[in-house]
Interface confidence: medium
């Protein structure tokens, strides 16, 4: 288990409040605020890294030790690397020292050297260099520390800088406890942990009510380390067959519950359409109608498969059609519900049908959906589409009825334009194109896709109302994909085949790809 | 001595474009974050765009955003500014910036950067 | 964006005079400020940056203090040199935006 963290300090959830002191006053150690991840972070930093005989100071406010024996001192600093700088900066460091004194009082902002012990030069694993420092990577480096055993009423920590390029972001001082434990239904008292133990204390638990020692097991005992951890766990207490753990203690089943083996889990009510069980089940049986999957665990109701989708619609828009529906209004108790969608269509001349799956493209694929949604599209124009939604879930298998809901509509799309190129040069293609005059009427404007061949990351779009464009601006003896879509108050109607054209080269040879 | 000589500025119609050059010399350019900030006549100073040394990350002023593209070819020591469909409000003198962070006595870098070499400027005049 | 305003927007000195420009950001910016200097027809020149770092090669008449929303550029003994534009830049946010100019005439 993990140790128990008693904070007496943390400059990092300060806020940039604490105010320490600085000695030689307004000179090395400078409180900043930065912002990393888009929120404002504090820091102490100097960076006095060109001017040699660097002693800067920077001294924590009195900190009450309280009942801390030992205490430990993370810091979460960034070192710029000495070769960032111009030159080298030859007087420049890379490290910085730690430093702590006791005391019974706090001296305010009489700053003495002498009062301080040293505890360690502090060196980072990582520096920052200048390619980092440029692209704003802080190279954190977290090292902590640890003094004891602390006898006076409280104590400073300070920094002193040599003539580095620091920062100063998180500076937390905590002592430890071994935190009072429940631990396999077995009860350890909390500990302090010792300042300098070499040996492990050693701690007694003991059994909640009505639960044992295992038939061949230790007696619980754990170790408190000096870090405040529990450690070294040995034997375990479980509640009695029939019992079930109940805040920290142990609990006969209740009628309508079962636990069929000696475990630290609890009793189980019996779950929803089974039947109910004597005291001491170790199962329950399913209701009439109702089934288990096989993978589905004793503890969840039984089920039964699902109602059919409860409101499905067809909405066309040119040559797709967007299936809307609602989950079944019984999900049959289960939450793994999908949905199938198959595809009809039928000729309106000739009344003949037959599936269409081979022959659309739908958004995502239409067996196993979750979501309540799906587009289908490259629908033909002039056909009536039957879409049909079924609704399963995990005990569907297990009946022969099927839950599904149907939707039909019809598809009146604009067909595809048909396109010519009329002329071209060096820089510029001029193209037309065509639609039946029936379908003219239905048309907005024309949408003109086009391309440079192999350049899949961008591609230019024109519009117009009128039957050709010339498309300008463009590099010489260069293919160009090149596709006409006609937009209707529908949306939009299917496109052409996608063209190959190519600019003339600047000698004015050069092929017409069509 | 760093050096930055700008060109490629002139009269061009709205609607138009341009591409501003900028060749640096004097320095290790690959070390430099570089930036293109404007001074319309007679008013202050505008932030346009930056790019890192090694070519990202790129930032535009909102003001230009979809409009300028900012390049560089560090083989050829060279900052570029591609300016489309040009207003009469780009109408500016377009100077090109650069800092190195080497310079900067700092232990953690300022959110973004300040310019500390900068070159004579070259003009801009959109106008029909 | 953030704002910078910066004020006077013009004074007029005598050489050898203390002149004190100030420049105000619309949030906290900490000390992520810098100021120039610009002459009519040249390019800005660095002066400051990081509110109070001197850059290299500029005169110890020029300084810069502030933090937070408040900043201001000294310059103690003004010299012919001196008249000029100054403005002020802040780069706690990408949009890197400037002071609109204080101008330091000829009294």
């Known amino acids: 288990a993990q140790g128990k963290e008693v904070v007496l300090l943390d400059f990092a959830a300060a806020g940039g409040e604490l105010g320490w002191l600085t000695h030689p006053y307004g000179k090395g150690w400078d409180l900043m605020q930065n912002i990393m991840n888009d929120m404002p972070i504090y820091m102490y930093s100097v960076c006095n890294v060109m001017s040699g005989d660097q002693d800067n100071w920077l001294r924590t406010n009195w900190v009450y030790r309280g009942e801390a024996e030992r205490i430990f001192i993370e810091l979460k600093f960034t070192v710029r690397d000495c070769n960032s700088f111009p030159g080298g900066a030859s007087s420049c460091k890379e490290t910085f020292n730690l430093y702590y004194a006791e005391s019974d009082l706090d001296y305010g902002t009489n700053f003495q050297k002498r009062l301080f012990t040293k505890i360690d030069t502090i060196a980072p694993d990582e520096i920052t260099v200048s390619s980092d420092f440029e692209a704003r990577h802080v190279k954190l480096n977290v090292e902590e520390r640890s003094v004891g055993p602390l006898t006076r009423k409280g104590f400073y920590l300070a920094f002193q800088d040599i003539g580095a390029c620091v920062a100063l972001l998180s500076v937390r001082v905590y002592y430890k406890k071994c935190p009072e434990l429940l631990q396999s239904l077995a009860r350890f008292p909390e500990t302090i942990a010792g300042s300098d133990a070499p040996s492990l204390a050693t701690v007694a638990g003991t059994c909640v009510d009505h639960a044992v020692v295992p038939p061949g097991g230790e007696e619980p005992r754990m170790h408190c380390a000096v870090d405040g951890e529990w450690l070294v766990p040995i034997g375990q207490c479980l509640c009695q067959a029939g019992y079930e753990k109940v805040e920290d203690a142990c609990q006969a089943c209740s009628p309508g519950f079962f636990k069929f083996e000696v475990s630290e889990s609890p009793c189980l009510e019996c779950p929803e359409h089974t039947l109910p069980s004597p005291e001491g089940a170790t199962s329950c049986e399913c209701e009439e109608g109702f089934f288990r999957a096989p993978q589905d665990p004793m503890s969840m109701p039984c089920t039964r498969p699902p109602s059919a989708p409860h409101y499905l619609t067809a909405v066309g828009m040119g040559a797709k059609v967007e299936l809307r529906w609602t989950p079944p209004q019984d999900s049959g108790g289960r939450e793994d519900i999908v949905y199938s969608v198959t595809c009809e269509q039928c000729w309106p001349e000739s009344g003949e049908c037959g599936p269409c799956e081979s022959s659309v493209r739908y958004s995502e694929p239409p067996h196993g959906l979750t979501r309540t949604s799906v587009t289908v599209s490259d629908l033909e124009p002039h056909m009536n589409y039957t879409f049909t939604v079924e609704a399963r879930n995990g005990v569907s298998g297990l009946v022969t009825s099927r839950s599904f809901r149907t939707a039909s509509v019809s598809i009146n799309q604009t067909e595809p334009p048909k396109v010519r190129l009329e002329g071209r040069s060096t820089t510029s293609l001029s193209v037309s194109w065509s639609i039946p005059p029936p379908q003219q009427s239905r048309v907005w404007k024309y949408e003109v896709t086009y391309r440079k061949k192999g350049d899949s990351n961008s591609y230019n779009v024109r519009r117009t109302e009128g039957f050709s464009v010339t498309l300008d601006d463009l590099a010489p003896d260069t293919t160009y994909l090149v596709q006409v879509q006609a937009l209707t108050q529908e949306g939009q109607g299917a496109g052409s085949k996608v063209h190959e054209f190519q600019t003339l080269s600047p000698e004015g040879s050069g092929s017409l790809a069509v | 001595e760093v050096q930055l000589l700008e060109s490629g500025g002139g009269l061009v119609q709205p609607g138009g474009s341009l591409r501003l050059s900028c060749a640096a010399s004097?320095?290790?350019?690959?070390?430099?974050?570089m930036a293109w900030v404007r001074q319309a006549p007679g008013k202050g100073l505008e932030w346009v765009s930056r790019?890192?040394?090694?070519?990202?990350?790129?930032h535009y002023a909102d003001s230009v955003k979809g409009r300028f593209t900012i390049s560089r070819d560090n083989s050829k020591n060279t900052l570029y500014l591609q300016m489309n469909s040009l207003r009469a409000e780009d109408t500016a003198v377009y100077y090109c910036?650069?800092?190195?962070?080497?310079?900067?006595?700092?232990?953690?870098?300022?959110?973004?950067?300040?310019?500390?070499?900068w070159g004579q400027g070259t003009l801009v005049t959109v106008s029909s | 964006d953030i704002q910078m305003t910066q004020s006077p927007s013009s004074l007029s000195a005598s050489v050898g005079d203390r002149v004190t420009i100030t420049c105000r950001a619309s949030?906290?910016?900490?000390?992520?400020l810098a100021w120039y200097q610009q002459k009519p027809g040249k390019a800005p020149k660095l002066l400051i940056y990081?509110?109070?770092n001197l850059h290299t090669g500029v005169p110890s008449r020029f300084s810069g203090s502030g933090s937070g929303t408040e900043f201001s550029l000294t310059i103690s003994g003004l010299q012919p040199d001196d008249f000029a534009t100054y403005y002020c830049?802040?780069?706690?946010?990408?949009?890197?935006?400037f002071g609109q100019g204080t101008k330091v005439e000829i009294k």
């Open positions: 949030q906290s910016i900490s000390t992520w």
């Open positions: 990081k509110a109070s």
């Open positions: 910036a650069g800092y190195d962070s080497g310079y900067d006595y700092v232990a953690v870098a300022g959110p973004a950067e300040y310019f500390q070499h």
């Open positions: 004097g320095f290790t350019f690959s070390h430099y974050m």
């Open positions: 830049q802040q780069y706690q946010s990408y949009s890197r935006t």
């Open positions: 790019i890192g040394p090694s070519g990202g990350p790129t």
